[in-house]
Interface confidence: low
């Protein structure tokens, strides 16, 4: 009893760790689109589950490569 | 998929302008709408899009008496604009601006145009 | 402001023949350059994105080029459906903007 009760907690520790990186939880991934050159200036802001709004998806894809962080993106538009 | 703007017309010096540009096939959510016009004889010229945040913006001749909306709900974008001249005289396209592609930014998708035509 | 300038206003080509317009930015737009081409009293019809890329159902005998400030599209093995006005269109900003096209290009086909 006790063996399956720690097997289920395992198992939904997982799922919900998975879980933070799917589109249905917490946001998507900004894609960079281009690696060879930097971002265009086009506006079109989307808000980061770090509750900071970027210009667009490709700003926010980039800042994640600098800083090595994973920040997604919580929805279109400014948060 | 298309876009198809709404009928123009004949309009008088200091009247307001509103086109809708009505989308099917594909969810404001996903692409930029872009406003473009060419006036007879001329070349194309770029009014203004509104993003997939639904943020508008304008060249900077249009940002003073121009407004571009939209409604997700009826998969419309609106441009309304204002102080009309016989400059303004144009066929009016609404385009699909796929800017998600950062540098491969392109309107891919035309209605085929309005006529709008400014005389007193 | 991102100005985009087109040489030549016109151009005189014979039947498979080759012709280059080129297309000029006034700041560097890295790649963002598309180009259209438009018949009279029709929409304009995408050809060319992201400098170099061929919008889909597009003939190869159209190319594109270039990056920064300096563009070039040129048609190969011109045919008589080729005679047309082309645009360069620049998606790299919009804030600071008059127009994001080119003056355009008529094509005419000899």
């Known amino acids: 009893m006790k063996v399956t009760g720690i097997f289920l907690l395992s198992a939904l520790a997982l799922l919900s760790l998975s879980g933070n990186t799917g589109a249905d939880s917490l946001g998507r991934e900004a894609k960079c689109y281009n690696e060879l050159n930097g971002c265009t200036k086009i506006y079109d802001p989307v808000c980061g589950t770090d509750g900071n709004t970027y210009p667009n998806e490709c700003v926010l894809c980039f800042e994640n490569r600098k800083r090595q962080t994973s920040i997604l993106i919580q929805k279109s538009g400014p948060c | 998929q298309s876009v198809k703007e709404s009928e123009g017309g004949l309009f008088k010096p200091t009247d307001t302008l509103t086109l809708t540009c009505t989308v099917s096939?594909?969810?404001?959510?996903?692409?930029?709408i872009s406003w473009v016009r060419q006036a007879p004889g001329n070349g194309l010229e770029w009014i203004g899009a509104i993003g997939k945040s639904g943020s508008a913006y304008y060249a900077s001749w249009a940002k003073s008496r121009s407004t571009i909306t939209r409604n997700t709900n009826l998969n419309t974008v609106s441009l309304k604009m204002t102080s009309l001249t016989a400059a303004d005289t144009a066929t009016y396209f609404c385009?699909?601006?796929?800017?998600?592609?950062?540098?491969?930014?392109?309107?891919?998708?035309w209605g085929q145009g309005t006529l709008v035509t400014v005389s007193s | 402001a991102y100005d985009m300038t087109q040489t030549p206003a016109s151009v005189e080509v014979a039947v498979g023949g080759t012709v280059t317009i080129k297309c000029q930015a006034s700041q560097s737009i890295s790649t963002a350059l598309a180009w259209y081409q438009q018949k009279p009293g029709q929409r304009p019809k995408l050809l060319i994105y992201g400098a170099s890329k061929l919008a889909s159902g597009v003939s190869s005998r159209f190319s594109g080029s270039g990056s920064g400030t300096e563009f070039t599209l040129t048609i190969s093995g011109v045919e008589c459906a080729d005679a047309a006005t082309y645009y360069c269109q620049q998606g790299y900003e919009t804030s600071n903007v008059d127009n994001a096209f080119g003056g355009g290009t008529e094509v005419v086909v000899k």
């Open positions: 385009a699909r601006w796929d800017s998600v592609g950062w540098t491969d930014a392109r309107l891919d998708l």
């Open positions: 096939g594909f969810s404001l959510s996903s692409y930029a």
